[in-house]
C-alpha cells in the first residue's frame, strides 16, 4: 500500500542499523571516489531526516521519493564536477532520469587500489575501539569497488566479518584465526559479486522477462515439488527484488527480500521440505541460507516431458493461446527434472524448444515437425558436459595455478588484443572454477562450472565494453547471455592479430619480486606468460612450458642467491635470450 512517507516506511521496516548500512552502500556504489567520512556524514544526515519523518510523516519533504531525497543529497556534494566529471551533469536532470544517469555512470572497474587487509593486531584494535565505524569502512570499501553488489547480501557478509572478528580478536593467535576465515568470506563475497553483476546485466540488457526465465529455471531445480503457480509467484517476487537492487533502490530491495524470505518460511509445505533450518535463523542469515538452500528431493512419479510438450496434439494450440505461460511451463517441467543441468543450458533448451515451435507450428503438419525436438537437444547437452569433463580432467592434472595458465594461454590466443591485466584477471577467475566445482559430486559439476564461467565471462564483456579491442570478444558479448559461454569456448586463435614485438623490458625482473606474496608472484609470472603468447600466438604448449619452467627456475635461483640484485641483473638477460631462442 502507499505510504505518506516512503523514507519513514523503510526506516520502520528495516530498523536503524540496516537502514544506515543500506544507505551507505547506496551512496558508495553511486559515488565511488568519495571517502568513507564524506559518505558517513551524508548517511547520518539522511538517517536523522528519516527519524523526523518517522515522528511526523507530514513534516517537510517527508513525502518525497527516495530517489529524490538521495539524489538531492548526492548532488549537494561539494566539488562534484572536479571529482566526478560528467557524472555531475546528472544533477541537471529530474527524476527518474537523474537516477538512470547515476546508474549509467557506475564504474565496474574503478581505479581504486586493491582493498588491503590490515594486519591482525591493528584490525582488532580498530574493531574493538569502534565496531560500527569498522563495519562501515568494510561496507564502503566493498560497495565502491563492486557497484552492483547485492546490498542485503553485503550486509550479511559484514555480519559474518563482525562475527569472525569478535571471535578471533579474543584469541591469542589472532592472525591464524582471522586469515583463513576472512579469506573464506572474501572468496564467497567475490563470487557473489560476479553472480549479482550477471543478474543485473541480464536485467539491463534483456529486461525482466529474461531474468524471470532465469529465476523460473533456478527455482524449479531447487524446489521440484512446488507447483508451477508457486514457482511463478517466487520468480515474480525474486525478479522484483533484483530489479530494485540493480536499479539502486536498495531499501526497497532489502525490504522486499525480507518479505520474500518470510513468505517462503510461512509456506514451506508448498515450496520445499528443506527450508526449516534456514527459517530458524535471524533475517540476514535466513535470506542468505534460502538463496543457496539444497535442492529438494525430486518427486518420484514425474511423467516423461514428451507427454505434454511433444506427443500432445494440442501443443501448437496451447502455444498460441498463451506463449509465455506455455514456454514457462516447459522450462519449469524440464528444470525440475534436471538439477544436474546449468541454468544457462536449461535456458538454451527452452530457446531451442521455442524456435522449434515457431517453425513447426507454422507448418501444415506441426506434430510431424516438432516430434524430434527432444532428440535435437542432445548436442546442446553434450557440449557443456564435454566442456566440464575436459576442463576438470585438466584441472586435476595441473592444479589451480597450472590450470589458470592453460586458460590464460587459450584466452590470450582467442583475444590477444585484450589488455594483459584483463586477461590475467579473467584467467585467474576462470581457473578458480576447478577448485570451486571439479571437486563436487558428478551431478553438481555442470551447473557449478557453467553458471560460474558465465558470470566471469559477463565481467570480461563489461570490461571490454569500456574499451572494445577484439572483434572476437565483441561478437561473443553482443549475443544473448546464455550463448556467451559456448561462443567463447568455440573461439580459436585470432588469425587477424599481428604479433607484438619482443620487448626485453617486458621480461625483465628485479629482486623485489622475491618478497611479494605468492599471489602477486603468480600474477607477475602470468603477466609474462600472456605477453609471451602475444609475441608468439602460435607457440606450442611445449614451447611455452619450456619457457615458463626456465622462468620459474630463474626466479627460484635468484631469490635464493646471497646477492639477489646481481643475480637478477646478470641472469635476467640470459633468460630473455633463452626465451627468444625457445620461441624462435
Amino acid at each position: 500500500e502507499a505510504h505518506k512517507s516512503e523514507i519513514a516506511h523503510r526506516y520502520n521496516d528495516l530498523g536503524e542499523q540496516h537502514f544506515k548500512g543500506l544507505v551507505l552502500i547506496a551512496f558508495s556504489q553511486y559515488l565511488q571516489k568519495c571517502s568513507y567520512d564524506e559518505h558517513a556524514k551524508l548517511v547520518q544526515e539522511v538517517t536523522d531526516f528519516a527519524k523526523t519523518c518517522v515522528a511526523d510523516e507530514s513534516a517537510a519533504n517527508c513525502d518525497k521519493s527516495l530517489h529524490t531525497l538521495f539524489g538531492d543529497k548526492l548532488c549537494a556534494i561539494p566539488n562534484l564536477r572536479e571529482n566526478y566529471g560528467e557524472l555531475a551533469d546528472c544533477c541537471t536532470k529530474q527524476e527518474p532520469e537523474r537516477n538512470e544517469c547515476f546508474l549509467q555512470h557506475k564504474d565496474d572497474n574503478p581505479s581504486l587500489p586493491p582493498f588491503e587487509r590490515p594486519e591482525a593486531e591493528a584490525m582488532c584494535t580498530s574493531f574493538k575501539e569502534n565496531p560500527t565505524t569498522f563495519m562501515g569502512h568494510y561496507l564502503h570499501e566493498v560497495a565502491r569497488r563492486h557497484p552492483y553488489f547485492y546490498a542485503p547480501e553485503l550486509l550479511y557478509y559484514a555480519e559474518q566479518y563482525n562475527e569472525i572478528l569478535t571471535q578471533c580478536c579474543a584469541e591469542a593467535d589472532k592472525e591464524s584465526c582471522l586469515t583463513p576465515k576472512l579469506d573464506g568470506v572474501k572468496e564467497k563475497a567475490l563470487v557473489s559479486s560476479v553472480r549479482q553483476r550477471m543478474k543485473c546485466s541480464s536485467m539491463q540488457k534483456f529486461g525482466e522477462r529474461a531474468f524471470k526465465a532465469w529465476a523460473v529455471a533456478r527455482l524449479s531445480q531447487t524446489f521440484p515439488n512446488a507447483d508451477f503457480a508457486e514457482i511463478t509467484k517466487l520468480a515474480t517476487d525474486l525478479t522484483k527484488v533484483n530489479k530494485e537492487c540493480c536499479h539502486g533502490d536498495l531499501l526497497e530491495c532489502a525490504d522486499d527480500r525480507a518479505e520474500l524470505a518470510k513468505y517462503m518460511c510461512e509456506n514451506q509445505a508448498t515450496i520445499s521440505s528443506k527450508l526449516q533450518t534456514c527459517c530458524d535463523k535471524p533475517l540476514l542469515k535466513k535470506a542468505h541460507c534460502l538463496s543457496e538452500v539444497e535442492h529438494d528431493t525430486m518427486p518420484a512419479d514425474l511423467p516423461a516431458i514428451a507427454a505434454d510438450f511433444v506427443e500432445d496434439q494440442e501443443v501448437c494450440k496451447n502455444y498460441a493461446e498463451a506463449k509465455d505461460v506455455f514456454l514457462g511451463t516447459f522450462l519449469y517441467e524440464y528444470s525440475r527434472r534436471h538439477p544436474d543441468y546449468s541454468v544457462s543450458l536449461l535456458l538454451r533448451l527452452a530457446k531451442k524448444y521455442e524456435a522449434t515451435l515457431e517453425k513447426c507450428c507454422a507448418e501444415a503438419n506441426p506434430p510431424a515437425c516438432y516430434g524430434t525436438v527432444l532428440a535435437e537437444f542432445q548436442p546442446l547437452v553434450e557440449e557443456p558436459k564435454n566442456l566440464v569433463k575436459t576442463n576438470c580432467d585438466l584441472y586435476e592434472k595441473l592444479g589451480e595455478y597450472g590450470f589458470q595458465n592453460a586458460i590464460l594461454v587459450r584466452y590470450t590466443q582467442k583475444a590477444p588484443q585484450v589488455s594483459t591485466p584483463t586477461l590475467v584477471e579473467a584467467a585467474r577467475n576462470l581457473g578458480r572454477v576447478g577448485t570451486k566445482c571439479c571437486t563436487l559430486p558428478e551431478d553438481q559439476r555442470l551447473p557449478c562450472v557453467e553458471d560460474y564461467l558465465s558470470a566471469i565471462l559477463n565481467r570480461v564483456c563489461l570490461l571490454h565494453e569500456k574499451t572494445p579491442v577484439s572483434e572476437h570478444v565483441t561478437k561473443c558479448c553482443s549475443g544473448s547471455l546464455v550463448e556467451r559461454r559456448p561462443c567463447f569456448s568455440a573461439l580459436t586463435v585470432d588469425e587477424t592479430y599481428v604479433p607484438k614485438e619482443f620487448k626485453a623490458e617486458t621480461f625483465t625482473f628485479h629482486s623485489d619480486i622475491c618478497t611479494l606474496p605468492e599471489k602477486e608472484k603468480q600474477i607477475k609470472k602470468q603477466t609474462a606468460l600472456a605477453e609471451l603468447v602475444k609475441h608468439k600466438p602460435k607457440a606450442t604448449a611445449e614451447q611455452l612450458k619450456t619457457v615458463m619452467d626456465d622462468f620459474a627456475q630463474f626466479l627460484d635461483t635468484c631469490c635464493k642467491a646471497a646477492d639477489k640484485d646481481t643475480c637478477f641483473s646478470t641472469e635476467g638477460p640470459n633468460l630473455v635470450t633463452r626465451c627468444k631462442d625457445a620461441l624462435a
Epitope: 501448437c316 494450440k317 507450428c361 501444415a364
Partner: nanobody, 115 residues
Framework: EVQLVESGGGLVQPGNSLRLSCAAS????????MSWVRQAPGKGLEWVSS????????LYADSVKGRFTISRDNAKTTLYLQMNSLRPEDTAVYYC????????SSQGTLVTVSS
C-alpha cells in the same frame, strides 16, 4: 484470448458446394498452421485438412482429396474451406483448429448434405 468463429454451414443437396469461413483472433494468425476437423452425428472427430502459416503447404484426408480446398487470408486472419461435390457422408459439424489440434475449442458450423 484466442477466438475461432466458424460460419458458412447450412443445408445443401448432394453434388452442390459450400464455402466455410473461420475468423481468428487473439494470436498471430500467420505464424500458425490451421486445420479443419469434423464430427459426424454419433461419430468421433475426424481430421479433414491442414494448411501452413504461409498458405504454401496443404494436406487433405483421402476422403476429401480432389473435392475440398483449404485456403487462408492472413491479412483478414481468416481460414476457408471450399467444399465441392458434397456427399451425404460429409454431413458433420466442422471446426477450425490451431496447429495439429484435434480438440476444437469453438462452436463449429453444421453442414448437412441431404436430398
Amino acid at each position: 484470448e484466442v477466438q475461432l468463429v466458424e460460419s458458412g454451414g447450412g443445408l445443401v443437396q448432394p453434388g452442390n458446394s459450400l464455402r466455410l469461413s473461420c475468423a481468428a483472433s487473439g494470436f498471430t494468425f500467420s505464424r500458425f498452421g490451421m486445420s479443419w476437423v469434423r464430427q459426424a452425428p454419433g461419430k468421433g472427430l475426424e481430421w479433414v485438412s491442414s494448411i501452413s502459416g504461409s498458405g504454401s503447404d496443404t494436406l487433405y484426408a483421402d476422403s476429401v482429396k480432389g473435392r475440398f480446398t483449404i485456403s487462408r487470408d492472413n491479412a483478414k486472419t481468416t481460414l476457408y474451406l471450399q467444399m465441392n461435390s458434397l456427399r451425404p457422408e460429409d454431413t458433420a459439424v466442422y471446426y477450425c483448429t490451431i496447429g495439429g489440434s484435434l480438440s476444437p475449442s469453438s462452436q463449429g458450423t453444421l453442414v448437412t448434405v441431404s436430398s
